[in-house]
């Protein structure tokens, strides 16, 4: 079952005063140990730690003359990063991506820009989500899943790619954003934080949560990921924070129960199908929408990302599975793999709920800073 | 039910060489980090050596590198540890161990290496 | 390496009394910290893992806390069967280290 925490009236992390400055989003300071691309997160002496290996997505798709038309994914190339303190007696540590792919990881070098110069980019993922100053836009309709209920048979394969835990969608799983904002899923994964350290990827008022999951979809309107990329509204991202609750989370238990089978990085094993819509919060209606980038190289603009208002719950014992039990490069632990929230550059976030709502009963009039953008232009 | 079974042990002169075997079952050990870990008698317990689910990364303690090599088997469900140059010093139980996010989870019930003229 | 330092050695209380160990790491290891405890003449049972939590089937009067150097391992309410060597380990990176070991007995 799923034990989303229900949010009716107040948005995700609370209200806020809010000035009347979009630009004073860039870069609300959050967690102290948030690691950027050129500042590793470091803290105490954890040996490794501070080359913690990353991340997500990168849907990178096969030349059609190997696959026609295939919506194949393949996993974004490994990241470096030294061993542990104690150099391992031998490294027969496979790269299964070849020495000719680009190298990247959270903290240190190389910096991101010179792995993919779009992650300099303006507009880029993911950042801090300030509610009050969002702008309400009731054209956002609620989002609609289409066949993600998946059976037992076919199983899907759960990968440590090295940067997070990836799990390849079947084709069928239809989305959509509004009328015409058709897409489809490819995969999901998930971004965590560390030893009772929150590692979501977005944050609330500079609240960061313990972890988030990303299901990384396909616009209808391309055949192929790398058609896509950089493309506005070519790639969509479902978003929602993880939160602690009291229950396990059987939905998730599916998923973390494996985790053991693929501690290693490169390893993978194949998992029953499952209902993917019920990794997510059940409110499809309340969440916010703007327009920014991969969070990892190749960093590609362009991506519509959706965050949930509501949370999905997990229990203690199922989030210290996800961040303790996964290896990556160099035998580092894979842990804290999220990038530091980016500027707005003048980006607004729409809502779809009139989430600058200050909930208080001496609220007579709602304070809305930003002006909705039509949905879907 | 988790099973961890050593083997191998036994009376063995200063410079010479011994081989443990540690057999696993109830859990699929072609996933799971495997230890060795030792205890002298009366004394308390120390790390000796770590090897990847893969055998991708392996690690020793001080005391023993360059003297001991640990290895698995994952068709056969076995961890190895070669044992060369014994000492005195190395007369402990052994211990097979496995690794997961809740450290040292299962221990086998040990085996005892005595090195000794 | 990272060091453990457990301390004390040994220590000798009453059944009911609430007993403290504890364990220092000589550099920060988040909350890598396992607790176990020994029994004479048998194999290591782990008690905690993660500084806190407990493994299923322990008794509720062994709790553990701390994390970054200091760590505790707290038994509530000392009972005879509670009598063994107790380790820390720490378990972040190679090579794991255990600490030199607690010796409870009953008074």
């Known amino acids: 079952q799923r034990l989303p925490r229900m949010q009716e009236d107040s948005p995700l992390g609370g209200g806020s005063s809010g000035e009347d400055d979009p630009l004073g989003e860039e870069d609300l300071p959050s967690e102290e140990d948030s690691p950027r691309e050129e500042d590793p997160p470091g803290e105490e002496d954890l040996p490794g730690e501070e080359d913690l290996p990353g991340e997500e997505d990168l849907p990178e798709v096969k030349p059609k003359s190997e696959e026609e038309g295939s919506l194949k994914l393949e996993d974004l190339p490994t990241v470096e990063a030294p061993g542990d303190p104690q150099e391992p007696q031998n490294n027969a540590h496979r790269d299964k991506e070849g020495d000719d792919q680009s190298h990247w990881r959270y903290g240190g070098d190389p910096p991101w820009p010179r792995v993919s110069p779009a992650c300099a980019g303006r507009f880029q993922s993911p950042v801090d989500i300030r509610p009050q100053l969002a702008a309400f836009c009731p054209a956002l309709r609620p989002l609609e899943l289409l066949g993600f209920q998946l059976p037992p048979l076919p199983e899907l394969r759960l990968r440590n790619n090295g940067h997070s835990v990836q799990l390849t969608l079947p084709p069928g799983l239809e989305m959509a954003l509004g009328p015409g904002r058709e897409y489809r899923a490819l995969q999901l994964h998930l971004h965590w934080g560390a030893a009772g350290r929150p590692g979501s990827e977005h944050t609330v008022e500079g609240h960061r949560f313990p972890a988030e999951i990303h299901v990384v979809h396909l616009s209808t309107a391309f055949a192929r990921v790398d058609e896509a990329l950089g493309r506005p509204g070519g790639l969509a991202v479902l978003a929602a924070f993880l939160e602690e609750g009291p229950e396990e989370n059987s939905a998730y238990e599916q998923l973390l129960s494996r985790l053991e089978e693929i501690a290693e990085e490169g390893s993978e094993t194949q998992v029953p199908g499952l209902d993917i819509s019920a990794l997510l919060p059940s409110d499809f209606s309340r969440y916010f929408q703007y327009e920014g980038s991969l969070t990892t190289p190749p960093c590609a603009q362009g991506v519509i990302w959706t965050v949930f208002n509501q949370t999905v719950m997990l229990s203690a014992k199922q989030l210290h599975t996800l961040s303790d039990t996964l290896w990556g490069p160099g035998d580092s632990r894979l842990q804290l793999n999220f990038r530091a929230t980016q500027p707005l550059n003048g980006r607004v976030i729409e809502a779809s709920f009139p989430a600058g709502v200050d909930s208080s009963p001496r609220a007579a009039e709602p304070v809305q800073l930003n002006s909705c953008l039509a949905a879907g232009d | 039910e988790v099973q961890l079974v050593e083997f191998g042990g036994g009376l063995v002169k200063p410079g010479g060489s011994l081989r443990l075997s540690c057999a696993a079952s109830g859990f699929t050990f072609s996933s799971f980090r495997m230890n060795w870990v030792r205890q002298a008698p009366g004394e308390g317990l120390e790390w000796v050596s770590s090897i990847t689910s893969s055998s991708s990364y392996i690690y020793y303690a001080d005391s023993v590198k360059g003297r001991f090599t640990i290895s698995r088997d994952n068709a056969k469900n076995s961890l190895y540890l070669q044992m060369n140059s014994l000492r005195a010093e190395d007369t402990a139980v052994y211990y097979c161990?496995?690794?997961?996010?809740?450290?040292?989870?299962?221990w086998g019930q040990g085996t005892l290496v005595t090195v000794s003229s | 390496d990272i060091q453990m330092t457990q301390s004390p050695s040994s220590l000798s209380a009453s059944v009911g009394d609430r007993v403290t160990i504890t364990c220092r790491a000589s550099?920060?290891?988040?909350?890598?910290l396992a607790w176990y405890q020994q029994k004479p003449g048998k194999v290591p049972k782990l008690l905690i893992y993660a500084a806190s939590t407990l493994q299923s089937g322990v008794p509720s009067r062994f709790s553990g806390s701390g994390s970054g150097t200091d760590f505790t391992l707290t038994i509530s309410s000392l009972q005879p069967e509670d009598v063994a060597v107790y380790y820390c380990l720490k378990y972040n990176s190679a090579p794991w280290t255990f600490g030199q070991g607690t010796k409870v007995e009953i008074k």
């Open positions: 550099q920060g290891i988040f909350n890598y």
């Open positions: 161990a496995r690794f997961t996010a809740m450290a040292l989870d299962y």
